[in-house]
């Protein structure tokens, strides 16, 4: 999905109002410095692409993030403010259901959510100096 035509201001507002709090709750008891940055993004559409990938694509180390509250709210936000997003997700959801569930390593999920927080922070930040 191409996130270029999303309403970034609305997505940012949703993130600050709800999604961020759920991510921080998930990470409670963990310092942000416990994990180094292993993923980045270079503009708002790119950030949303990487956020979607980390949130909804199961990995061998962390298979279950899509069921978390922050993931559900992320999905709802993208469906609301990115034209045509929900249609593109129907096939992806059906494909996901066919995958076998793997055992989750909690620490690896914490690491993945830490990366998600970093991506969201890049998405909402007012940029560096422009010279």
């Amino acid at each position: 999905y191409d996130f270029t035509n999303c309403d970034f201001q609305k997505i940012e507002a949703d993130y600050l109002r709800t999604i961020s709090k759920d991510l921080i709750t998930y990470m409670s008891g963990t310092k942000s410095t416990d994990f180094n940055n292993t993923v980045s993004c270079s503009n708002r559409p790119h950030c949303l692409t990487e956020i979607q990938s980390l949130t909804f694509n199961p990995t061998p180390r962390c298979a279950s993030l899509a069921k978390e509250m922050f993931a559900r709210k992320t999905k709802a936000t993208l469906a609301l403010w990115c034209p045509g997003y929900s249609e593109t997700q129907i096939n992806a959801t059906q494909a996901m259901k066919k995958r076998r569930k793997r055992k989750v390593t909690t620490n690896k999920c914490l690491e993945q959510v830490s990366q998600l927080l970093g991506l969201w922070r890049r998405f909402i930040r007012t940029l560096l100096k422009k010279q």
Epitope: N37, T38, C41, E50, K130, Q131
Partner: antibody, heavy 122, light 108 residues
Framework: QMQLVESGGGVVQPGRSLRLSCAAS????????MHWVRQAPGKGLEWVAV????????HYADSVKGRFTITRDNSKNTLNLQMNSLRAEDTAVYYC???????????????WGQGTMVTVSS | SYVLTQPPSVSVAPGQTARITCGGN??????VHWYQQKPGQAPVLVVY???DRPSWIPERFSGSNSGNTATLTISRGEAGDEADYYC???????????FGGGTKLTVL
């Protein structure tokens, strides 16, 4: 852990070519801008080239423009530097480094490789 | 192209504060990054975006940037801080990375 490992250095005669590689691991390579930086013996750091996270755009230092080519393969997590028409002044340790980018701004180089030595001598 | 100027060397007594400067035209409008390099090793990022510090760098390292000068401050200097320090910016107007010439820090 996050790692960059350079290879391909060696001794080469002036006018000849050499290809350096940098293998990335432990992070999502395709989301970072990647640089080559060199350091001549006893001298300071000199930036050589950068390639955008997507490979769409490339920038070179004037000293290597037209002779060096930076490329990346995001499917293999590798960065390359093809060096042609080598000169004695290209003798240096060559480092690859990663940097987050935002739009057309490259941020700090937060991970560096250990370097590979290139000696241009007849 | 853009030029960054650093003093070739700076000395500090153990436990004292070292300040390494980096000069450039209107440097305060650029984001300045600082690297530490010990002999035979690769550079290590110690301060980015003028004053931010990677999680693995001690709080003794700090940075500031305004006007035409950026400063890397190392408080309570230790023997292990002896190294070359480089400032760096991304020059958007020319799409080039620019490094300062480097400063050798000696802990007396």
């Amino acid at each position: 852990q996050m790692q960059l490992v350079e290879s391909g250095g060696g001794v080469v005669q002036p006018g000849r070519s050499l290809r350096l590689s940098c293998a990335a691991s432990g992070f999502t390579f395709r989301t970072y801008g990647m640089h080559w930086v060199r350091q001549a013996p006893g001298k300071g750091l000199e930036w050589v080239a950068v390639i955008w996270y997507s490979g769409a755009y490339i920038h070179y230092a004037d000293s290597v423009k037209g002779r060096f080519t930076i490329t990346r393969d995001n499917s293999k997590n590798t960065l390359n530097l093809q060096m042609n028409s080598l000169r004695a002044e290209d003798t240096a340790v060559y480092y690859c480094s990663r940097s987050p980018q935002w739009e057309d701004i490259f941020e700090a180089m937060d991970i560096w490789g250990q370097g590979t030595m290139v000696t241009v001598s007849s | 192209s853009y030029v960054l100027t650093q003093p070739p060397s700076v000395s500090v007594a153990p436990g004292q504060t070292a300040r390494i400067t980096c000069g450039g035209n209107n440097l305060g409008s650029y984001s300045v990054h600082w690297y530490q390099q010990k002999p035979g090793q690769a550079p290590v990022l110690v301060v980015y975006d003028d004053s931010d510090r990677p999680s693995w760098i001690p709080e003794r390292f700090s940075g500031s940037n305004s006007g035409n000068t950026a400063t890397l401050t190392i408080s309570r200097g230790e023997a292990g801080d002896e190294a070359d320090y480089y400032c760096q910016v991304w020059d958007m107007s020319s799409s080039l990375v620019v490094f300062g010439g480097g400063t050798k820090l000696t802990v007396l």
